[in-house]
């Protein structure tokens, strides 16, 4: 019945370590029954494959059908509205899904002190969906480094930050005692991919972490 | 292209309250840091209050713990700063932060930079 319905305003991806997700923005005056058909098109595949003929959520997980990004040429997505035996042209997403676009995390940090340094373990993102031998630090093998910012809580803005090559580091807290909080942000030297801050992981340091040396 | 618009700034007297608002458009992240920050003439920027989208936990500055409370509006897309009892020192130009968080692992706010700023909105209170 033609292409009476308005197409979705806008497709992008949104995507962490092995976390692919799809999203796009509803088409005006939607109706209850308006869902959305999702498909996707591999690079050096060059044909369209259906994915989800009726969605009713603005975003979908892709995870599954994209495990191979990081040994790909990358992927594009389309979206269209479909209400009865109506529906809209397709929306494309408008750059190329690929290894770039992955917004790297960490997993967690883990913080402990010794003689007056907080000691701090990087732990990468382990997610159950990643195919066994595609780890973070296989996928980035090199150059992998990660932002630093530490702070004295309560009631302060004020980071401290720091840069680091490996996923263990310290960092000397000049004698100050009190509670201080890290965060982290992973980059990779040799690419663009955007990083994201941690969950903060705050350590107590007290008088009795330092050793009295005369 | 991400965008954030603060509105809500004026001139009011000392004791008096003022109601922040700041609406994201084309910013698609769900979980985010959102923060407020003002920065008086001749003065360093500083943080006042944040919020974690993903959780409504929120952060406050010393200086304004127990006078302004930061809240959110998910469907609008919009953070608020209530601003109660006001102090001439509070003058300042405020502005709107947003930093993006992890969906699988969550995050903390206030974050230590922010990728997303706003113009600003003033702030004079008077005695």
């Known amino acids: 019945h033609g292409t009476e319905l308005p197409s979705p305003p806008s497709v992008w991806f949104e995507a962490e370590f092995f976390h692919h997700i799809l999203h796009w923005t509803p088409i005006p005056n939607q109706s209850e029954s308006t869902c959305y058909e999702v498909a996707l098109l591999r690079y050096g595949i060059e044909s369209w494959n259906s994915i989800s003929n009726c969605s009713q959520t603005l975003s979908y997980d892709l995870t599954a059908v994209t495990l191979d990004l990081y040994h790909s040429n990358g992927y594009r997505a389309r979206v269209r509205a479909v209400d009865g035996s109506r529906h809209s042209n397709w929306t494309v997403t408008n750059t190329r899904f690929s290894v770039d676009e992955v917004t790297l995390t960490v997993g967690s940090v883990n913080l402990e002190i010794h003689n007056g340094f907080i000691l701090g373990k990087i732990q990468l993102p382990r997610p159950k969906m990643a195919p066994a031998n595609d780890t973070y630090e296989s996928i980035f093998s090199h150059f992998r480094e990660y932002e630093i910012a530490i702070r004295k809580v309560p009631g302060n803005f004020t980071f401290t930050h720091k840069k680091v090559k490996h996923e263990n580091f310290s960092l000397l807290t000049s004698g100050e005692v009190g509670e201080f909080c890290v965060q982290v942000k992973p980059s990779v030297a040799s690419r663009s991919n955007k990083g994201m801050w941690s969950k903060e992981e705050c350590i107590s340091l007290t008088r009795q972490y330092f050793t009295v040396t005369n | 292209q991400v965008q954030l618009q603060e509105s809500g700034g004026g001139s009011v007297q000392a004791g008096g309250s003022l109601r922040l608002s700041c609406t994201v458009s084309?910013?698609?992240?769900?979980?985010?840091?959102m923060g407020w920050f003002r920065q008086a003439p001749g003065k360093e920027r500083e943080g006042v209050a944040t919020?974690?989208?993903?959780?409504?936990?929120?952060y406050y500055a010393d200086s304004v713990k127990g006078r302004f409370t930061i809240s959110q509006d998910n469907a609008k897309n919009t953070v608020y700063l209530q601003m109660n009892n006001l102090k001439p020192e509070d003058t300042a130009m405020y502005y709107c932060a947003a930093e993006p968080l992890s969906r699988v692992y969550g995050g903390s706010c206030p974050t230590p930079t922010f990728d997303y700023w706003g113009q600003g909105t003033q702030v004079t209170v008077s005695s």
């Open positions: 919020i974690y989208t993903g959780g409504g936990n929120t």
């Open positions: 084309g910013y698609t992240y769900s979980s985010n840091c």
